[in-house]
């Protein structure tokens, strides 16, 4: 498993766990079932990963290829401003919202959408590959 922060950049290396997809320098898990935002977060953390934190537009565009109209939870929340779970602000993309109660972030092939955190959705986890050292 990666050493250090869950949010570190990983070096290239081959292996991801079963049912995880290797993409660039990370492993991604696209869920089949649906959970609310908190349960999705817990699922990822229990597997030494985190709910998807997108670092830039390029990563977002690449991931959207694998998405449909259906929304997936990602590691994005509105706590006095939209922030990723690693604490960084959302600054490379806009998020659609229509209500103050929509404080959790989701993604589909069209972009980012705010939602009530209690909606059951698919989710995406992200982690470093096996036997890799995180780069700091």
């Amino acid at each position: 498993l990666c050493q250090g922060s869950n949010y570190s950049t990983c070096a290239s290396c081959p292996s991801c766990p079963d049912r995880w997809m290797k993409y660039g320098n990370h492993c991604y898990y696209f869920s089949v079932e649906e959970k609310d935002w908190n349960s999705s977060l817990e699922f990822c953390l229990a597997r030494d990963s985190h709910l998807l934190v997108i670092t830039d537009n390029q990563e977002m565009s690449l991931l959207q290829v694998f998405l449909s109209e259906a929304f997936c939870w990602i590691g994005l929340r509105n706590n006095s401003g939209w922030r990723w779970e690693d604490g960084s602000p959302l600054n490379f993309s806009r998020i659609s919202s229509n209500s103050f109660v929509q404080t959790c972030g989701a993604i589909n092939k069209n972009g980012l959408q705010a939602s009530s955190c209690e909606v059951p959705l698919h989710w995406v986890c992200k982690k470093c590959p096996f036997a890799d050292q995180a780069l700091f």
Partner: antibody, heavy 123, light 107 residues
């Protein structure tokens, strides 16, 4: 028919406490976020609190945070507002409102309102 | 907080007249705006949601529109039961905020 019925309003001394209730019927209560909104004597409407459908998430404005607590009992189809450390400026008619169903893209908020219950804070 | 500036605060008009009430938002709220009607007994009823969608059971003489940050409620031909109070409500941003209200009075 959607019905919201508030109760529990009373005359309370400054610093006192009270619990307001809102009985809901005519819809699946556990699927909806719910809110309290008050109307001050000068007829201004102010949002007081919102609670998510399961009760896990709550939202408050700064002026009531720490003094007011919104809660719900989905088994009883009832919304509550515990008000404490009351001030004269909390004097108002308190309304409960159905605030939105738990879905992703949704635009239908604050659609039904109760008839209100009066809270008067005075010594 | 987003300020909703509603005007006029009161309006005298005649039966059959066309009137427009406006709310101006201090920040972008998209289409996240409702228009509410409050009767003399204090009962609150939503007329318009998401800027321009008419609630079921609301007469077609009521309509909502938007131009930039200014939102309007138009009553095409006033009837006697329309002479009550009206409020706008933005629900995009926390805290949700209301306009100061417009009291519609019969001339």
């Amino acid at each position: 028919e959607v019905l919201l019925m508030e109760s529990g309003g009373d005359l309370v001394k400054p610093g006192g406490s009270l619990k307001l209730s809102c009985a809901a019927s005519g819809f699946t209560f556990s699927s909806y976020d719910m809110s309290w909104v008050r109307q001050t004597p000068d007829k201004r409407l102010e949002w007081v609190a919102t609670i998510s459908s399961s009760g896990r998430y709550t939202f408050y404005p700064d002026n009531v945070k720490g003094r007011f607590t919104i809660s719900r009992d989905n088994a009883k189809n009832t919304l509550y507002l515990q008000v404490s450390n009351l001030k004269s400026e909390d004097t108002a008619m308190y309304y409960c409102s159905r605030t939105g169903v738990t879905t992703v893209v949704f635009t239908d908020y604050f659609d039904y309102w109760g008839q209100g219950t009066t809270l008067t804070v005075s010594s | 907080d987003i300020q909703m500036t509603q005007s006029p605060s009161s309006l005298s008009a005649s039966l059959g007249e066309r009137v427009s009430l406006t709310c101006r938002a201090s920040q972008d709220i998209g289409n996240s705006l409702n228009w509410l009607q409050q009767g003399p007994d204090g009962t609150i009823k939503r007329l318009i949601y998401a800027t321009s969608s008419l609630d079921s059971g609301v007469p077609k003489r009521f309509s909502g529109s938007r131009s930039g940050s200014t939102y309007s409620l138009t009553i095409s031909s006033l009837e006697s039961e329309d002479f009550v109070a009206y409020y706008c409500l933005q629900y995009l941003s926390s805290p949700p905020t209301f306009g100061g209200g417009t009291k519609l009075e019969i001339k």
